[in-house]
């Protein structure tokens, strides 16, 4: 006899970035039928849904319109069908973003680089906080962090084409509480014409757009946006 | 403490060729990165050319592309800088760097004058 259904989906739209005072609706997909959906923030329960009809339904919505520092933080949601609730998701971490500073991005030895060299990007924030991190932006999430009193380096080593692409970073000031991205950096590396093909980078986006793209946990969702998987989400843990 | 010497500077005509030279106090072999950067007249520093020391892998800023040719020599622990096809556009101060580790310019000389004109 089973006694848990399979856990849910949960993932944030447009993004788990969210800067601060903008909207961002946490999402969790269950199975049809489920009569109550429960959101968990942190431990305790959040908010609370029940789809109507509920066998036509298999995704709910909770929204918050306005982001901030108390808003961020972990969430797992939970469903039922009848009397039996399901495991929980996977945790979803909620970050505010454009929190108090603006931090310098800048690459060494510079933007532009030969396959092969050893490249490192340095992120450099002059107030209260000791841990960055770098973002690749893309398909797939590339995230690194880096720790420093008002800077943070971040050696790629040597690189190879797949390096290439638009990076920002952020200054912390806890796992959650990020600081506004810095001016994006784009990172051009050229290959040995005669012995490496030069591969496309990965999509990126517009800076207008930045933040504007899907995090999940669930690397099995497939949604009609750009999909980053989980690894942003595990190295904040 | 280590010191970088540029010297090979100096007045060219257009289109004729010059060699920099670039002596330094310590061991090379070890350093990650040399490279030649240059600045012109009322213009901010730019990266003309370097070289990474274990792999050979040179990069040339476009401008000097096919022009330029950077080449270093570990036993005399001296970084060179072979320019021919010479253009009004190359005249700069132009200085030596070394970057022992692959993350920062460590050391810079103090530069040498070349000036084409005709």
């Known amino acids: 006899q089973q006694q848990t259904l399979p856990k849910p989906f949960i993932w944030a739209e447009p993004h788990f970035m969210v800067p601060k005072e903008k909207q961002v609706t946490i999402c969790c997909q269950g199975n049809y039928g489920a009569v109550e959906y429960q959101l968990h923030f942190e431990g305790s329960l959040f908010a609370v849904d029940r789809p109507k009809p509920p066998e036509r339904i298999n995704k709910v919505q909770f929204y918050i319109p306005d982001m901030n520092s108390r808003m961020a933080g972990q969430y797992s949601c939970i469903y039922r069908v009848g009397e039996l609730w399901s495991e929980p998701s996977n945790l979803l971490d909620l970050v505010v973003t454009e929190m108090y500073d603006t931090p310098t991005l800048s690459v060494h030895p510079g933007p532009e680089v030969i396959s092969g060299e050893k490249v490192t990007f340095y992120c450099r924030l002059d107030t209260a906080t000791s841990m960055f991190l770098l973002l690749k932006e893309g398909r797939s999430s590339h995230v690194q962090r880096g720790y420093g009193k008002v800077q943070a380096e971040f050696p790629l080593g040597p690189v190879t084409t797949a390096h290439r692409g638009t990076y920002r970073c952020f200054g912390s000031y806890n796992n959650h509480a990020w600081s506004f991205p810095s001016e994006p950096v784009k990172l051009l590396v050229t290959g040995d014409i005669e012995n490496t093909s030069l591969a496309p980078e990965d999509p990126t986006f517009p800076a207008d757009t930045w933040g504007t793209y899907l995090l999940t946990t669930e690397t099995g969702l497939q949604k009609d946006h750009a999909l980053w998987d989980h690894t942003a989400q595990n190295l904040l843990r | 403490d280590v010191q970088l010497v540029e010297s090979g500077g100096g007045v060219v005509q257009p289109g004729r060729s010059l060699r920099l030279s670039c002596a330094a106090s310590?061991?090379?072999?070890?350093?990650?990165?040399m490279g030649w950067f240059r600045q012109a007249p009322g213009k901010g520093r730019e990266v003309v050319a370097r070289?990474?020391?274990?792999?050979?892998?040179?990069y040339y800023a476009g401008s000097v592309k096919g022009r330029f040719t950077i080449s270093r020599d570990n036993s005399k622990n001296t970084l060179y800088l072979q320019m021919s096809s010479l253009r009004a556009e190359d005249t700069a101060v132009y200085y030596c760097?070394?970057?022992?580790?692959?993350?920062?310019?460590?050391?810079w000389g103090q530069g040498t004058l070349v000036t084409v004109s005709s």
């Open positions: 070289i990474s020391g274990d792999t050979n892998i040179k």
């Open positions: 310590g061991r090379t072999e070890s350093w990650y990165r």
């Open positions: 760097a070394a970057d022992r580790t692959g993350a920062t310019w460590d050391y």
